[in-house]
């Protein structure tokens, strides 16, 4: 039986050109976590798997970063990265847990960080 | 300088288990490394059989994860191989082979060859 | 599941400039290697990443990836070349794949 919850920032906003970390944080559950993706849409962004380390895939090496922690970093943002994206942890013995944020990137200086929420 | 050395009959009757060995000097085995199995049939292409991390935790080819078993010896120097219920299919010179993080592979033994015959 | 995808053959003049290429939708997400294999011996690593080459590898391979291909090209094909050119990747799972394999001959 899947116990777990997966905790993320949420709806975010961040400003073109700028920086944001995306973080998801998987609680209530001694399941063991294998491996976190990290997709936009159908696009694999980066995976962190607990033997393998960190891959960042190809199309986002230059836009990518690792961490902080199981997080990922998205750097110089364009418009074109509003969208959705989405942590996956699979874990064992549970199965597969997936956590959304919706980011926008946006023109202005007015970009403010939205709630947090849960996803059972 | 990695070295990796295969042994293990050459040998296998049909149904029966094979079982290699791969002897690992010139790095820890609690390294960061992972080890992993790959064969080669006559004549034919590479195929990887699957690996296991130094924390013990395996990760196998899905269309032999049924008959495959990989672990480290007892000593923590050697990488052990089963596959079980072989067929003459499984006629294949085996190599073990080791690397870190995602990719590549890069260190191979010289392989061993392994005939599944009566 | 995913497969690497190769051509069989492919021959070049000696001198002459040869591209061995790969493709996979695994390779949108993550990175090949390269290894060459010469007949009796175990197979060598020649390039990882993109073009990333280990030490004692000639200048003369080098890669290059675009959308779900990878390609590996050896400009001024030496008779030492002609061997079985293996490409390799992993999916999404960790899982590692390699390609069938191109046999390259050097004319």
């Known amino acids: 039986m899947m116990t777990g919850t997966i905790e993320t920032t949420g709806n975010i906003s961040a400003e073109k050109g700028g920086s944001i970390i995306l973080q998801c944080h998987l609680s209530s559950t001694t399941a063991q976590v294998t491996q976190v993706n990290w997709e936009q849409q159908d696009q694999l962004l980066a995976i962190c798997n607990a033997d393998l380390g960190w891959h960042i895939s190809p199309s986002f090496k230059d836009r990518v970063a690792p961490g902080p922690g199981l997080g990922l970093t998205l750097q110089s943002l364009t418009v074109n990265d509003t969208g959705e994206y989405f942590c996956i942890y699979h874990t064992y013995p549970d199965g597969t847990y997936t956590g959304r944020i919706f980011l926008e990137v946006l023109e202005s200086s007015v970009a403010e960080h939205g709630a947090r929420f849960q996803i059972p | 300088q990695v070295q990796l050395q295969e042994s293990g009959p050459g040998l296998v009757k049909p149904s029966g288990t094979l079982s290699l060995t791969c002897a690992v000097s010139?790095?820890?085995?609690?390294?960061?490394?992972?080890w992993s199995w790959v064969r080669q049939p006559p004549g034919k292409g590479l195929e990887w059989i699957g690996e296991?991390?130094?924390?013990?935790?395996?990760n196998y080819n899905p269309s032999l994860k049924s008959r495959v078993t990989i672990s480290v010896g007892k000593s923590r120097n050697h990488i052990s191989l089963k596959l079980s219920s072989v067929t003459a299919a499984d006629t294949a010179v085996y190599y073990c082979?080791?690397?870190?993080?995602?990719?590549?592979?890069?260190?191979w033994g010289q392989g061993t060859l392994v005939t599944v015959s009566s | 599941s995913y497969e690497l995808t190769q051509d069989p053959a492919v021959s070049v003049a000696l001198g002459q400039t040869v591209r061995i290429t790969c493709q996979g939708d695994?390779?949108?997400?993550?990175?090949a290697s390269w290894y060459q294999q010469k007949p009796g011996q175990a197979p060598l690593l020649v390039l990882y990443?993109?073009?990333d080459r280990p030490s004692g590898i000639p200048d003369r391979f080098s890669g290059s990836r675009s959308g779900t291909t990878a390609s590996l090209t050896i400009t001024g094909a030496q008779a030492e070349d002609e061997a079985d050119y293996y490409c390799?990747?992993?999916?999404?799972?960790?899982?590692?794949?390699f390609g069938g394999g191109t046999k390259l001959t050097v004319l």
């Open positions: 082979t080791t690397g870190s993080g995602w990719y590549p592979i890069d260190y």
């Open positions: 695994s390779l949108r997400g993550f990175y």
């Open positions: 010139g790095v820890s085995i609690r390294q960061g490394h992972w």
């Open positions: 296991i991390y130094q924390t013990g935790r395996t």
């Open positions: 390799n990747s992993r999916d999404s799972n960790g899982a590692m794949m």
């Open positions: 990443g993109v073009k």
